[in-house]
Interface confidence: medium
């Protein structure tokens, strides 16, 4: 699948041809003269994110599969790993190391020829959009944010589940049923379908040949690769189908006509009882199997289709992924399931996204509807935090309640706090902790969304196993939240890892925005902080020197936050006093690169630490840069 990340890693190479077949590669090498060491790179048609290297030697073409390792490196089976396909080719131009000869001359794409996109590519964007829309019932900004923040995960999800949307995939039907379906209508040789055999990822390919239905087992190996016995291995079913549609390669014949899912005609429709199809199934278009699919229907997770006996399910209807597990909310990633995404959580959308939950006109909440737990979750500059439960119109929402210190009860602060709370209550983005409202009771209480895993710095201190990919994902989410605040003309003023809370290990939210302003936390407040906890270390020079706060000063703080994250929650400028930090910055010195932190991320930190406000990037630029790097790394 030429995902954006894969395209980035090879599309720029003039000798990369994209999704061409082995035969097409050989034709190109013949065009190039078939001299020893002539080579080209193409996209693997059986491994997601992988490549194939086609090399001429002795007037013959030799093909090597380049697999993409889990850590994002590339290797020819049994060979050494390389950071990119380009590096691998460069290495083999000096060392044959298992290849038939050295790579001597790249065969570059003829003028006007672009790398060929796979059949899945054209569909991918639409599939992702539809999947997100229908799976999580999102629209508008929530939909866009979901697609941006989770694109790599969604691409993988779509790639590995795309077969479920294909007309040739019939879910878990019996061998007998599959034969009946194949034999209905036209008796074209090569007509086929794929059915699921069991819950462990085993399938069967049912192929019509001379009036007989042949059944080929498709097994999944330990690494998740799919193959017919003794056959070529593939990452996905659609890649397997695509391959056997142009090459028999062990089958009695090539696949020609997909046997339509009962009840569908051109479109994929995953519901209802089966209708007998007409005798004119969809033709196998030149554009490949997948490009014929025009519309999709995804079930809602948790939507109960039926509850047949566990372990012995008889499917009388053909539905989307008939053996899909039904999962309880507490276990959204249970079973042979994907990882929980931010959209799976209760706090991705505003509690008021449900039209029946009417947003109160007042920012005030009824204290009687709020229940607090005894134990404190934590305490910060502004007070203590407790877990609570707020009775909304339809549901009881788990909330975090910030109980402000008594000085916040100063009547002079009341208007300011209320005004700020009114603004904060209007802010609505998946990557900020939404404020549900405030209560005036024993103390001022701010009622906010709950983020169970707590502050980012503490979490990383205690979980050193978190990979840098995961950290990039989290800081990217923070940049998305900050981009939203910037667009809303809202300045955080206290952005730091302690004020980023985790909902899950893969979902971050910004908290405590605007509180420093609302509670008049001026220079005196900061000077009153205990030594070593001064937010000065997160402050841009113009904040320290002139008390000038802006979204650009938040960008500086974001750079420090990134440093904290890649340092696994270490304190910035450790052991230094505020005045020493200021002097260091004035000299043009900056904190060093955290151990193991990718160079690109440290470069971005330094960009955030641009002394001059005018030249410092805004969050729109920071988010885009992070996004591109994140996609590249994750893919």
């Amino acid at each position: 699948m030429a995902s954006s990340g894969m395209a980035d890693s090879a599309n720029h190479l003039p000798f990369f041809f994209g999704n061409i077949t082995r035969e097409e590669a050989e034709d190109y090498l013949v065009q190039g003269g078939m001299s020893d060491g002539l080579y080209l790179l193409r996209q693997s048609r059986n491994y997601l994110g992988g490549f194939a290297l086609s090399v001429a030697h002795g007037r013959k073409a030799h093909h090597y599969t380049i697999e993409r390792e889990l850590n994002g490196t590339y290797a020819i089976a049994g060979g050494r790993t390389h950071a990119s396909p380009a590096d691998l080719c460069h290495y083999h131009s000096q060392e044959s190391d298992g290849l038939v000869c050295l790579l001597k001359k790249p065969f570059n794409r003829p003028q006007g020829v672009q790398p060929k996109t796979g059949p899945f590519e054209d569909l991918k964007e639409n599939l992702i959009r539809e999947y997100v829309k229908q799976t999580w019932n999102l629209q508008g900004q929530a939909l866009e944010q979901a697609i941006i923040s989770q694109k790599p995960q969604l691409e993988k999800l779509i790639a590995t589940t795309a077969h479920e949307k294909m007309p040739w995939f019939h879910g878990k039907i019996s061998r007998e049923e599959s034969e009946q379906i194949v034999l209905i209508g036209s008796k074209t040789n090569g007509k086929f379908l794929i059915r699921a055999r069991d819950n462990n990822g085993s399938y069967a390919l049912c192929l019509l040949h001379e009036g007989k239905v042949l059944h080929y087992r498709i097994d999944k190996d330990k690494t998740g690769k799919l193959s017919i016995p003794e056959g070529k291995k593939f990452d996905t079913l659609w890649q397997l189908v695509e391959h056997y549609s142009y090459k028999a390669d062990g089958l009695l014949r090539v696949l020609t006509v997909p046997c339509q899912k009962i009840g569908t005609q051109g479109n994929v429709n995953f519901g209802g009882r089966p209708q007998l199809p007409g005798s004119h199934p969809a033709t196998w278009s030149a554009g490949g199997i997948i490009s014929r699919i025009k519309s999709y229907s995804f079930p809602k997770p948790g939507h109960r289709k039926s509850s047949p006996a566990q372990g012995n399910r008889q499917e009388s209807t053909v539905s989307f992924n008939p053996y899909e597990p039904e999962l309880a909310p507490w276990a959204a990633d249970k079973g042979p399931q994907r990882e929980a995404l931010p959209m799976d959580t209760e706090v991705y959308e505003s509690p008021y996204a449900d039209p029946e939950e009417i947003r109160p006109k007042e920012v005030y909440l009824d204290r009687k509807l709020l229940t607090l737990e005894d134990k404190e979750l934590g305490s910060g500059n502004f007070g203590t935090v407790k877990k609570g439960y707020y009775q909304m119109k339809k549901v009881v929402k788990t909330v975090a309640v910030k109980i402000l210190k008594n000085e916040a009860n100063d009547p002079a602060l009341k208007d300011e706090l209320l005004a700020e709370a009114n603004v904060m209550q209007q802010l609505d983005n998946p990557y900020i902790v939404r404020m549900i409202g405030i209560c005036e009771a024993e103390s001022w209480m701010l009622v906010m969304e709950m983020a169970e895993l707590g502050p980012l710095n503490k979490y990383l201190q205690q979980n050193r196993h978190v990979k840098d990919k995961n950290i990039i994902e989290l800081v990217h989410q923070v940049s998305m939240g900050m981009k939203y605040l910037e667009e809303s003309n809202f300045v955080h003023r206290d952005l730091a890892a302690r004020n980023v809370l985790l909902v899950t290990q893969h979902y971050a939210k910004i908290s405590d925005f605007g509180l420093s302003k609302a509670l008049r936390a001026d220079e005196n407040y900061y000077k009153a902080q205990t030594h070593g906890k001064w937010p000065v270390k997160w402050y841009a020079p113009e904040c320290i020197n002139y008390y000038k706060f802006s979204s650009k000063s938040d960008v500086w703080s974001f750079g420090v936050l990134m440093w904290e994250a890649f340092s696994y929650g270490q304190k910035p400028y450790r052991g230094m006093k505020g005045s020493e930090v200021t002097a260091m910055l004035e000299k043009g010195e900056r904190m060093g690169c955290p151990a193991g932190c990718p160079r690109e991320m440290y470069d971005l930190m330094n960009l955030c630490w641009t002394y001059d406000v005018e030249n410092r990037p805004g969050f729109a630029a920071v988010e885009l840069r992070l996004r591109n790097y994140y996609y590249d790394v994750v893919n």
């Epitope: 999962l327 309880a328 507490w330 249970k334 079973g335 399931q337």
Partner: antibody, heavy 119, light 106 residues
Framework: EVQLLESGGGLVQPGGSLRLSCAAS????????MSWVRQAPGKGLEWVSG????????YYADSVKGRFTISRDNSKNTLYLQMNSLRAEDTAVYYC????????????WGQGTLVTVSS | DIQMTQSPSSLSASVGDRVTITCRAS??????LNWYQQKPGKAPKLLIY???SLQSGVPSRFSGSGSGTDFTLTISSLQPEDFATYYC????????FGQGTKLEIK
């Protein structure tokens, strides 16, 4: 045939530690979430902890949070429960159980291992 | 936490009887309810999942019903091997079990 075999139980003093293991066979271990459930002598069942299939999300009952750690090694088909700061009230038979695909019923259980916390 | 309350806590019945055990959740749990049977010295066994679905291999005399907060396990005609303790368990949020119902021979 699905089999779950717990080990590692025994007598331990209050404040001590113990590590339970559960060896799984007969199914694709990495595809299923797993749980630990305990039963104090003569008492009912109490869910202790759970862990997801591939991404190792962990869940704990309040009574053990901060003291017990669930983990798994998919390459070894083994589930673990590290129990620290043990108390007398942790005395129980500990069962490991597979979380079924459908609505999270605990569809297969081990025979249990007895943990006794006493001075 | 969601509290699960079973009733009765014990009951006596004879072979051939129809027996009903109820389970109430302290808040709505949709259909996230499972029923287990446990015999002395043995591990529990899943009977019913998703409130009403019979686990594979479990005799059809066992049935479950209910949704929301009130659930019922019914044994249509008691067999000698059915005398045991029965537990309900919710899996809507972190799992919790009922206190158990001991079914004894009359």
């Amino acid at each position: 045939e699905v089999q779950l075999l717990e080990s590692g139980g025994g007598l331990v003093q209050p404040g001590g530690s113990l590590r339970l293991s559960c060896a799984a066979s007969g199914f694709t271990f990495s595809s299923y979430a797993m749980s630990w459930v305990r039963q104090a002598p003569g008492k009912g069942l109490e869910w202790v902890s759970g862990i997801s299939s591939g991404y190792y999300y962990t869940y704990y009952a309040d009574s053990v949070k901060g003291r017990f750690t669930i983990s798994r090694d998919n390459s070894k088909n083994t589930l673990y429960l590290q129990m620290n700061s043990l108390r007398a009230e942790d005395t129980a038979v500990y069962y490991c159980a597979r979380v079924g695909w459908y609505w999270n019923g605990l569809d297969y259980w081990g025979q249990g291992t007895l943990v006794t916390v006493s001075s | 936490d969601i509290q699960m309350t079973q009733s009765p806590s014990s009951l006596s019945a004879s072979v051939g009887d129809r027996v009903t055990i109820t389970c109430r959740a302290s808040q709505s749990i949709s259909s996230y309810l499972n029923w287990y049977q446990q015999k002395p010295g043995k591990a529990p066994k899943l009977l019913i999942y998703a409130a009403s679905s019979l686990q594979s291999g479990v005799p059809s005399r066992f049935s479950g019903s209910g949704s929301g907060t009130d659930f019922t396990l019914t044994i249509s005609s008691l067999q000698p091997e059915d005398f045991a303790t029965y537990y309900c368990q919710q899996s809507s949020v972190l799992p919790t079990f009922g206190q158990g119902t001991k079914l004894e021979i009359k």
